[in-house]
């Protein structure tokens, strides 16, 4: 039997200090450049080696960035999101969503994360 792929979604607050070339990650997404179909959110496409995000270690490629310094990133054009990061200041607080892929057992088998029983 084939296993079922589920996702464990968690949120985390990450505080980064801007380095000489920014916060050390690239973004994709926005209302004009959807990275995920039917989702105009802003996603991390690359963590730069030795950049602020890599040195912190918590932000991962594929994470969705929900807010920057408390400012929601919903329904933004790509360039407007970029401008938020560019102008966010020296100490930057990110609210991020991690989406961890979880491989469950065969369909019908209750996985560890199943709250029933």
């Amino acid at each position: 039997m084939n296993g079922r792929v589920d996702y464990l979604v968690t949120e985390e607050e990450i505080n980064l200090t801007r380095g000489p070339s920014g916060l050390g990650f690239n973004i994709v997404g926005g209302t004009d450049q959807q990275y995920v179909s039917n989702d105009s959110g802003i996603y991390v496409s690359r963590i730069k080696e030795n950049g602020a995000a890599a040195l912190d270690g918590r932000l991962q490629e594929g994470d969705k960035i929900l807010s920057v310094n408390g400012q929601d990133l919903k329904n933004l054009l790509h360039q407007d999101a970029v401008d938020l990061f560019r102008n966010a200041g020296y100490a930057v607080s990110l609210r991020v969503q991690h989406r961890l892929q979880v491989q469950n057992g065969p369909i019908g088998h209750r996985g560890e994360g199943d709250p029933s029983g």
Partner: nanobody
């Protein structure tokens, strides 16, 4: 310190070719979306060709089929191969990188990039 240094410009006849180079120091080129821009006297700056960190490319309509952007990650250098040059390609050519955007189209259309070179002059004239 992040630095971009362009070279390879010059005077060329219509129909000729040039290869521009942009050497990066202070950062790893393939971690960035980066591109080539040009500005002719009295005209607005124009995004010519850009490439994302994952290798997706964008070309302005005016250069499609004539110009090719490429990157050598070992030499940490960006290139622009320019063929079938026309007088209207005459301009000061710059390379520039975004610290955040990884969308090559947005980078080429942006007037808010983070690292710029000084430029190299390309003149197409007989």
């Amino acid at each position: 310190e992040v630095q971009l240094v362009e070279s390879g410009g010059g005077l060329v006849q219509p129909g000729g070719s040039l290869r521009l180079s942009c050497a990066a120091s202070g950062f790893t080129l393939d971690d960035y979306a980066i591109g080539w821009f040009r500005q002719a006297p009295g005209k607005e700056r124009e995004g010519v060709s850009c490439i994302s960190s994952h290798g997706s490319t964008y070309y302005a309509d005016s250069v499609k089929g004539r110009f090719t952007i490429s990157r050598d990650n070992v030499k940490n250098t960006l290139y622009l191969q320019m063929n079938s040059l026309k007088p209207e390609d005459t301009a000061l050519y710059y390379c520039a990188a975004s610290y955040y955007s990884d969308y090559e189209v947005a980078v080429c259309r942006s007037d808010a990039l983070d690292a710029w070179g000084q430029g190299t002059q390309v003149t197409v004239s007989s």
